[in-house]
Amino acid sequence: EPTMYGEILSPNYPQAYPSEVEKSWDIEVPEGYGIHLYFTHLDIELSENCAYDSVQIISGDTEEGRLCGQRSSNNPHSPIVEEFQVPYNKLQVIFKSDFSNEERFTGFAAYYVATDINECTDFVDVPCSHFCNNFIGGYFCSCPPEYFLHDDMKNCGVNCSGDVFTALIGEIASPNYPKPYPENSRCEYQIRLEKGFQVVVTLRREDFDVEAADSAGNCLDSLVFVAGDRQFGPYCGHGFPGPLNIETKSNALDIIFQTDLTGQKKGWKLRYHGDPMPCPKEDTPNSVWEPAKAKYVFRDVVQITCLDGFEVVEGRVGATSFYSTCQSNGKWSNSKLKCQPVDCGIPESIENGKVEDPESTLFGSVIRYTCEEPYYYMENGGGGEYHCAGNGSWVNEVLGPELPKCVPVCGVPREPFEEKQRIIGGSDADIKNFPWQVFFDNPWAGGALINEYWVLTAAHVVEGNREPTMYVGSTSVQTSRLAKSKMLTPEHVFIHPGWKLLEVPEGRTNFDNDIALVRLKDPVKMGPTVSPICLPGTSSDYNLMDGDLGLISGWGRTEKRDRAVRLKAARLPVAPLRKCKEVKVEKPTADAEAYVFTPNMICAGGEKGMDSCKGDSGGAFAVQDPNDKTKFYAAGLVSWGPQCGTYGLYTRVKNYVDWIMKTMQENSTPRED
């Protein structure tokens, strides 16, 4: 426990002290006091530097003194032979004796007392920034007028913090400006403006004089601006070193002025004002801003319109423009929205054609549609090339957004028919020679495919069976082969209105208008064994002349059997109608004169016994197109004949083209796109 005074005596004092002793005393007086230590008796073996025996006085790490020998007081009125004054409240006294003493030494007697110290004057480091006041056992600091004592109770500063500026314009200066600013102060000023306005600070170079930086470049006194997570400064020196106009991009600004104890200058003065928060003129690619301005500020609204071929995609909805507002935080609303290239998407597939997978489906990309050649061609032109247009559609120069239509190529057999030997008198044929040939199994007959949905045949073939079963693509009509071929299902049968329906068809003598159309339920897929025959044109080029050659095909009666198993065909010349009239009817069901011959009939055959016969009815009499030798058209349909192996009569298809076209148009189903 600290004491105010005390006595220290060497061992055995006042008797001689023993050899080889080391004894120490720790003196402690209360905090705020120093120690006055004085010796009233000193009798210790003398040696150089008191090396043998000694009394040592230590204050902290400092040796205040080392005593030996004999002393006596210089003052007859005072018993003190040696004294020490320390401004600290702790002291150590150490007594040491060596192994031998040549004489008898009595040691020492010492006393200590607590003494007041003057903290204001006794130390190198002044404890108070301004005024120091000493009292017994301590001191206190005080401040000049308008200063206040900081919490450390040592430093004085000015009360320059706490001001909040909310006006849109104002002026702030350091304390006492332009007189020197207070030392050892931290001044904080707050500017708080309405959201959407940024604080802009303006200074003049001459309005700034703050203690300069040290040799390491650190400001001893400093002015700092803090706006959110952005800091401007610290600034110091003679003349403002920073930008004279500081745009803080924030509606809140803290100004911090920190001074140290030395080097006071005149300080600083600044002006501030609130600018509507600017929003950057962002570079939004592929778009136009309306209105266009050099600078945009809080509450400005712009319409951002995408250039042609670009769109704003938000969710699943595409738009060509959007509005953006300059917000209070200096950021644009809808800033995530961008003008992206229009995506036309995966192009639609087309029937009987294809489009190669595009590398890109974005604006400006090009795709090409092609038809499944050689069985289909592009009917509506345009070349099949489409580009991704600005409106998000695939567009063709000719057709616009309309898709190309792949329609069957007509009248082109994959393999030409060659007569191999001398249908009656005909040759074996392959379905590839006559891909338009349709087989009807009840009654056993033929027909001609004229497009994906329509079969042309003779009226007498379908008059007794309005739901005929038809097959395409097979050379053989064996049940096993037909099972593997394409069966066509009828939707409706259209018999020519001029065809006379009889109660007993077997007795028919009038085959005028022997033509019918069968509308199919489903479109036929074309290929090497299935492909339509062309219809005749309406020009005079398609008027047949005697001797013109045509091909007939079918599975009808041959010389060898009543029904052909494999397709037969023959090449026949057109003959004058009278040649047909002259032939005697083989099994007449009526008087020979009763048989009707009209201009709607073509007579053909009569050469080498080549003729159509029972079971060939409805098949095409195919003639080379006069305007395109690669194609065949249906000039006639097998209708009737007086006698197999002579001349046969064929319905003249040219006379019915208008009826065929009209019937097909009126009964076409709109394509389900």
Partner: antibody
Framework: EVQLVESGGGVVRPGGSLRLSCAAS????????MSWVRQAPGKGLEWVSG????????GYADSVKGRFTISRDNAKNSLYLQMNSLRAEDTALYYC??????????????????WGKGTTVTVSS | DIQMTQSPSSLSASVGDRVTITCRAS??????LGWYQQKPGKAPKRLIY???NLQSGVPSRFSGSGSGTEFTLTISSLQPEDFATYYC?????????FGGGTKVEIK
């Protein structure tokens, strides 16, 4: 050359079984229907059974129904007649014959245009 | 079942004779009928199909006619190789049925 060759005939006790085979060559077997016809010694012809080109349709004479089974293996160009529960009256010369079937949904049969030489089946105790 | 009745069951004729064999169906069979020739120890051979169509390779002296229930096979001029047994076959419906046969012998 179109040819049909029967085999598998022989002597069997009543109640026994036999399997006749008919090997076809010289034509596309799976394009034709096939028939079995038998002829008892000194008697006329009797149609026994028939099968269409792909084996999906069969027919039998009343006298063999439930006892005989006709089948075909198009991959092997072969026709078969499995005869079970044989009776003495099944003793006969068994022919296989080719049937032509034309047309699709509505078809036309041309039966037995080609015949084999036959194989003899004797049912005796 | 459709019964086929053939007549006569046998006949004697001379070379060069015109021979007619008849087959009657118990119900109408349209023209679904064939005629077969069988010689002793041989397999039958088709002569006519669909009542009137001559099988390829068969001499034209053979002809068939009829429809419905009455059918006829005619040999216009009998030849030595024509002596055989003749059968008709109906294939209108299952079970197929043969006629009892007509044996043509040398007179």
């Amino acid at each position: 050359e179109v040819q049909l060759v029967e085999s598998g005939g022989g002597v069997v006790r009543p109640g026994g079984s036999l399997r006749l085979s008919c090997a076809a060559s010289g034509f596309t077997f799976d394009d034709y229907g096939m028939s079995w016809v038998r002829q008892a010694p000194g008697k006329g012809l009797e149609w026994v059974s028939g099968i269409n080109w792909e084996g999906g349709s069969t027919g039998y004479a009343d006298s063999v129904k439930g006892r005989f089974t006709i089948s075909r293996d198009n991959a092997k160009n072969s026709l078969y007649l499995q005869m079970n529960s044989l009776r003495a009256e099944d003793t006969a010369l068994y022919y296989c014959a080719r049937d032509e079937q034309l047309g699709g949904k509505y078809y036309y049969y041309y039966y037995m245009d080609v015949w084999g030489k036959g194989t003899t089946v004797t049912v005796s105790s | 079942d459709i019964q086929m009745t053939q007549s006569p069951s046998s006949l004697s004729a001379s070379v060069g004779d015109r021979v007619t064999i008849t087959c009657r169906a118990s119900q109408g069979i349209r023209n679904d009928l064939g005629w077969y020739q069988q010689k002793p120890g041989k397999a039958p051979k088709r002569l006519i199909y669909t009542a009137s169509n001559l099988q390829s390779g068969v001499p034209s002296r053979f002809s068939g006619s009829g429809s419905g229930t009455e059918f006829t096979l005619t040999i216009s001029s009998l030849q030595p190789e024509d002596f055989a047994t003749y059968y008709c076959l109906q294939y209108r419906s299952h079970p197929l049925t043969f006629g009892g046969g007509t044996k043509v012998e040398i007179k």
